[in-house]
Amino acid sequence: SSSPTSSASSFSSSAPFLASAVSAQPPLPDQCPALCECSEAARTVKCVNRNLTEVPTDLPAYVRNLFLTGNQLAVLPAGAFARRPPLAELAALNLSGSRLDEVRAGAFEHLPSLRQLDLSHNPLADLSPFAFSGSNASVSAPSPLVELILNHIVPPEDERQNRSFEGMVVAALLAGRALQGLRRLELASNHFLYLPRDVLAQLPSLRHLDLSNNSLVSLTYVSFRNLTHLESLHLEDNALKVLHNGTLAELQGLPHIRVFLDNNPWVCDCHMADMVTWLKETEVVQGKDRLTCAYPEKMRNRVLLELNSADLDCDPILPPSLQTS
């Protein structure tokens, strides 16, 4: 996420005793919370790798970029950033790697300028459906979020709730149609096995979608048709075996798209013929000559672009009487 940076000398660290003394009062204009570094010139506050267990209450009102990375926040309650006066300037919030396992409904309410949010590298076992929308209304007020970074938020298997992790994340993305203005969504490294079919249709403003390093086997039921602004689609490092005609046609129909497909176990049999034909013609796939067959073994390492229809056969299915167990 792009955020201004400043030299260390422009940051002021507060004296630790100040924080407890004034935490219940409105912050002084130039105050910096304990264990944080602040630069009013850069409108930036960094509370990084300090093992904080809660969001500091006395954040300066000028903050535009807030880094709360490498802490031990555990839970982000409703109104975690609600202040009087509100943090009206806060535009970029980075909470990555802060051991969050629960984000509650309305956690980001009262942040009218929040455009970039990074929750990556937190084991989010419980992400409220209303974490981003703030309310359970069927149509919420539009969120100002433009960029939502949710890479590696999958919790360890033994900590997952008894429900689909994909479903939990998608529910939060779609609640109240609050994220209609979202332009960048990163969902890399989350062990996603599938993409719920309705998710993309309801995020029409997306420019950049990163689904890399998941376990997606198929895109058969995923529609890209509505995503007319989509510029980059990252599908590297998944478990894709083939892309079928419907998907190929939809991708080809997107005017600005670049698709990244490296490191997928492509199965080069008769079902691959349409994709090979498409690859030879399309300009949308980046590094397309690096796509190689993984299966069957006789085809392993063959370059997809160099295949022709005669190479792509399917072993005949034997009638039951000839099959061996």
Epitope: N213, D237, V303
Partner: antibody, heavy 116, light 107 residues
Framework: QVQLQQSGAELMKPGASVKLSCKAT????????IEWIKQRPGHGLEWIGE????????DYNEKFKGKATFTADTSSNTAYMQLSSLTTEDSAIYYC?????????WGQGTLVTVSA | DIQMTQTTSSLSASLGDRVTISCSAS??????LNWYQQKPDGTVKLLIY???SLHSGVPSRFSGSGSGTDYSLTISNLEPEDIATYYC?????????FGGGTKLEIK
């Protein structure tokens, strides 16, 4: 069957360039990437980079950019690697292999010795 | 770059032994791991691809396993022709990288 036949050993002076060859037989040369690997005693195996012969596409290990240059001649089914501005650090055995998800078939290696 | 580490650089075993060679990656490599055998004459052969798939023509006494960052090659019944150096290699991210090798010798 698939074979990769590499050129013979080379004794070179520091500062010179050398061009190694790797002739492929037994498969469709343009259908697979060719990888180049360096082996120096005590340094294990290092991936230098790769070339897709039919298209001329290349990938280089950052460490070998400016040192190695790959080319291929599809009429003779031969891949080449040129090493420039040789130093004693370039003394090694160089292998070509057929890639890309694994290095399935290997040449016998070419020993390059750089000595004043 | 992804670092591949073979902690045992040499290993001595008797004929008929079961031998396990380990390899670890500096980050998760999603089972994108191969094993190679290099004979004393320099000849290199692919043994195992994608962590556990036996390359055609390789004896079934060779097997591979692992996940995440930790992988291993097992030779179940050591034969004289298995005397060689064994290398692991990741193909999860360019540049492809190798372990330092484990030299297997007969006791």
């Amino acid at each position: 069957q698939v074979q990769l036949q590499q050129s013979g050993a080379e004794l070179m002076k520091p500062g010179a360039s050398v061009k190694l060859s790797c002739k492929a037989t037994g498969y469709t040369f343009t259908g697979y990437w060719i990888e180049w690997i360096k082996q120096r005693p005590g340094h294990g195996l290092e991936w230098i980079g790769e070339i897709l012969p039919g298209r001329g596409s290349t990938d280089y290990n950052e460490k070998f950019k400016g040192k190695a240059t790959f080319t291929a001649d599809t009429s003779s089914n031969t891949a080449y690697m040129q090493l420039s501005s040789l130093t004693t650090e370039d003394s090694a055995i160089y292998y070509c292999t057929r890639g890309r998800l694994d290095f399935t078939y290997w040449g016998q290696g070419t020993l390059v010795t750089v000595s004043a | 770059d992804i670092q591949m580490t073979q902690t045992t650089s040499s290993l001595s075993a008797s004929l008929g032994d079961r031998v396990t060679i380990s390899c670890s990656a500096s980050q998760g490599i999603r089972n994108y791991l191969n094993w190679y055998q290099q004979k004393p004459d320099g000849t290199v052969k692919l043994l195992i691809y994608y962590t556990s798939s036996l390359h055609s023509g390789v004896p079934s006494r060779f097997s591979g396993s692992g996940s995440g960052t930790d992988y291993s090659l097992t030779i179940s019944n050591l034969e004289p022709e298995d005397i060689a150096t064994y290398y692991c290699q990741q193909y999860s991210k360019v540049p492809w990288t190798f372990g330092g090798g484990t030299k297997l010798e007969i006791k």
